[in-house]
């Protein structure tokens, strides 16, 4: 065994940046650091066969399989994949190790399988086997976390039944409103499943895996806060767990909290209380109402009452199926070139939606913000004043929703012209859609004031580019204007733009760009 070469097999992951690299190049794209694949001699095999850890790759990922050989002298090599021989160019690194690489670009099913590398060195011949398969991400899921009470303890467990198993974290905040944004210094994150500190202002649990991140907020009624103008509403699907926390602070311990559903006290086993003294010696009590698996008859007004605070309620609505409620009628907007403007969609949905904004086949991240009235809003401001069609798409486990917007930017026309043997055409994308005039320039009319009305054909909205309308006007050539300069002008309420064309022979001849008023 002593005279066998020391073999190191590594996997290099590439961040795809659409570079087109040949199959067996040694220097591909932007790379992650190499991962050791634990190459070892295959037990009980005839001949010297090394085997690398099996590799599982996402569809479309790009990787390099690489072998580093610590053996004296030169080496020659050959890759074999599905009975086909592939070229192999070894080179030497700074430690004088032989380096052989196989680049797999944008992994597909056809590139999965066994890659055999045959190496011949001065001392010995050996084979290295790589097994590459495609990761089955169809099985991946990411489910919204939910809460359970920990057995025999006043603590909550956060559970997310997801594949691969997610990292679960509690996101806690003790201040009000905006300062509880995710990256605010007031926010504390705890990467654990069990939470004992349940007195905070805002408590969320988040789960994340390869598919992203999902969060669930602990629904809270704070008796020391002024009630919202509209009754807070909580939606749940049949079978889901219900958790509502009622919180109250008082100068001393002489107060109690109770939960009622539709004026009937909750049954024993559907609530538990915790209390603590805060730093200023006031007493904080919290009372949880919970149902491990809700049914339709758990719908109703849940009221938290205190002997020292005004009571507050929340409406719990149990639905069979998730929903997205919003108006889906399309909306058209026209704005000035430098006007600040955002699209917005107001919706009510359960479970929480995943959404995207799309323009010109490009998707943009979608943020949603909860409003006090139980509605949520998503705004899109990143349109960069590009006119066209914008699409908002939202979905959750049970429903889908799409809404179209058209954005028109008020600006004066800009004219492009082209000419052929038989006609001249002008195009403009100004908004409002422009009107057209054609003028002939001659000795009689050096300023091109002689209007042409014969043979003019206007087409409004001749083509739609991602919702952007283009207007055109075509002038059919007649003997009367052949050989002359003609001028097409597009005008709207914001101004006029003209282009001059020489009508003499075939081919596109825009001649001069005229003054634009």
């Amino acid at each position: 065994n002593q005279d066998l070469p020391v073999i190191k097999c590594v996997l290099i992951n590439h961040k795809n940046n659409d570079s087109s690299v040949g199959k067996s190049s040694s220097y591909p794209m932007v790379s992650e650091s190499p991962e050791d694949l634990g190459c070892a001699l295959r037990p009980q095999s005839s001949g010297t066969v090394y085997e690398a850890a099996a590799v599982e790759v996402d569809v479309s990922a790009s990787i390099t399989l690489q072998v580093l050989v610590d053996a004296p002298g030169n080496i020659s090599c050959l890759w074999v994949f599905k009975h086909s021989s592939l070229n192999c160019q070894p080179h030497f690194d700074l430690q004088n190790r032989g380096v052989v690489s196989m680049v797999i670009l944008k992994m597909t099913e056809t590139q999965a399988g066994e890659y055999l590398l045959f190496i011949q060195s001065e001392a010995t011949n050996y084979t290295i086997l790589f097994t590459v398969s495609i990761r089955n991400t169809l099985l991946y899921t990411l489910r919204r976390p939910y809460f359970r009470k920990m057995e025999n303890q006043d603590a909550l467990v956060c559970i997310s039944e997801s594949v691969p198993e997610p990292i679960v974290e509690w996101v806690l905040c003790d201040s009000q409103g905006e300062s509880c944004k995710e990256e605010s210094p007031a926010v504390v994150k705890k990467e654990e499943k069990v939470l004992h500190e349940l007195f905070g202002t805002d408590i969320r649990c988040c789960a994340r895996n390869e598919l992203g991140r999902e969060c669930t907020r602990l629904f809270t009624i704070d008796l020391n806060q002024t009630p919202q103008t509209t009754l807070p509403q909580l939606f749940l699907k049949v079978g889901e767990p219900l958790w509502i926390r009622c919180k109250a602070v008082h100068v001393n311990h002489g107060f109690g909290l109770t939960w009622e559903l539709e004026n009937k006290a909750l049954e024993e086993g559907n609530y538990f209380e915790m209390s603590t003294y805060s730093t200023n010696r006031t007493m904080i009590r919290i009372l949880f109402a919970f149902v491990s698996s809700v049914a339709r008859n758990d719908t109703g007004y849940y009221t938290c009452s205190s002997s020292k605070h005004p009571s507050q309620s929340a409406l719990v609505t149990i639905v069979e199926k998730g929903f997205i409620n919003a108006t889906n009628s399309s909306e058209d907007y026209e704005i000035d070139q430098y006007e600040e403007f955002c699209f917005s969609v107001r919706f009510k949905a359960y479970p929480q939606i995943r959404c995207t904004w799309t323009f010109s086949r490009k998707s943009f991240p979608c943020e949603q913000k909860g409003l006090d009235n139980g509605y949520s809003i998503s705004k899109f401001c990143n349109h960069k004043h590009q006119p066209g069609e914008y699409i908002f798409h939202a979905e959750n486990d049970d429903a889908q929703f799409t809404k179209m917007f058209t954005l028109n930017i008020r600006r004066k026309p800009q004219v492009l012209a082209e000419a052929s043997a038989s006609q001249a055409s002008c195009f403009s994308d100004g908004y409002p859609l422009p009107s057209w005039t054609w003028k002939k320039c001659s000795d009689k009319s050096p300023n091109c004031t002689e209007e042409i009305t014969e043979g003019v054909w206007n087409r409004k909205a001749n083509r739609k580019v991602f919702g952007q309308w283009v207007s055109s006007s075509t002038l059919n050539m007649s003997e009367a204007i052949k050989g002359f300069l003609v001028k097409c002008c597009a005008y709207n309420s914001l101004g006029t733009s003209c282009e001059t064309i020489l009508l003499n022979s075939p081919g596109p001849f825009p001649f001069i760009q005229d003054n634009i008023s």
Epitope: E35, P43, A53, E114, T131
Partner: antibody, heavy 124, light 107 residues
Framework: QVTLKESGPALVKPTETLTLTCTLS??????????VSWIRQPPGKCLEWLAH???????SYSTSLKSRLTISKDTSKSQVVLTMTNMDPEDTATYYC????????????????WGQGILVTVSS | DIQMTQSPSSLSASVGDRVTITCRAS??????LAWYQQKPGKAPKRLIY???SLQSGVPSRFSGSGSGTEFTLTISSLQPEDFATYYC?????????FGCGTKVEIK
């Protein structure tokens, strides 16, 4: 260069929960078929396998300690975490993490690399 | 659970000696066995995997043999750096189990 490094408290009190982290470098539990195990060794005693977690997130636990152990991984941080509840002085040991490699033809790459170990003492 | 019984639990030998350590499984484990060497205060180091395959970088004086229930680690000519404790591990079925070690001491 493959390395595994254990971190966590050197001292825990009886009934408390122990959380140990194994930080990996030079390999990952992302694309290659690999697993990371936790193994412990009480002073002057035998090695005892506790648990392992595979790159596809499957887990296996020691039968006798199953109810007390939880193993998890965070691929983005290259970490494997072991928690052990209700610690007892009997759990005083050096805790190691080690790598397992799964080959195309089977899992025979058990514990080819080990961390240096962390001595955890359980005492009030 | 599969029990792994290692023998002897300790032995004294001199440099140059041939040393044999045995590991017996309570049921058949094919060749799903590895051997490890551990020195005081250090983590174990793998010597042999799949019962008889030598770990890369391990001197060829170490060899492994056996299949089923009886396995042997042999050091053909003991060197000063070989004084340590040796463990076998079965990875045929859960839970994975180690033998309780054989301590090789200087005579």
């Amino acid at each position: 260069q493959v390395t595994l490094k254990e971190s966590g408290p050197a001292l825990v009190k009886p009934t408390e929960t122990l959380t140990l982290t194994c930080t990996l470098s030079g390999f990952s539990l992302n694309n290659a078929r690999m697993a990371v195990s936790w193994i412990r060794q009480p002073p002057g005693k035998c090695l005892e396998w506790l648990a392992h977690i595979f790159s596809n997130d499957e887990k296996s636990y020691s039968t006798s300690l199953k109810s007390r152990l939880t193993i998890s991984k965070d691929t983005s941080k290259s970490q494997v975490v072991l928690t052990m509840t209700n610690m007892d002085p009997e759990d005083t040991a050096t805790y190691y993490c080690a790598r397992i490699v799964g080959y195309g033809t089977g899992w025979y790459g058990f514990f080819d690399y080990w961390g240096q170990g962390i001595l955890v003492t359980v005492s009030s | 659970d599969i029990q792994m019984t290692q023998s002897p639990s300790s032995l004294s030998a001199s440099v140059g000696d041939r040393v044999t350590i045995t590991c017996r499984a309570s049921q058949g484990i094919r060749n799903d066995l590895a051997w490890y060497q551990q020195k005081p205060g250090k983590a174990p180091k793998r010597l042999i995997y799949a019962a008889s395959s030598l770990q890369s970088g391990v001197p060829s004086r170490f060899s492994g043999s056996g299949s089923g229930t009886e396995f042997t680690l042999t050091i053909s000519s003991l060197q000063p750096e070989d004084f340590a404790t040796y463990y076998c591990l079965q990875h045929n079925s859960y839970p994975l189990t180690f033998g309780c070690g054989t301590k090789v001491e200087i005579k």
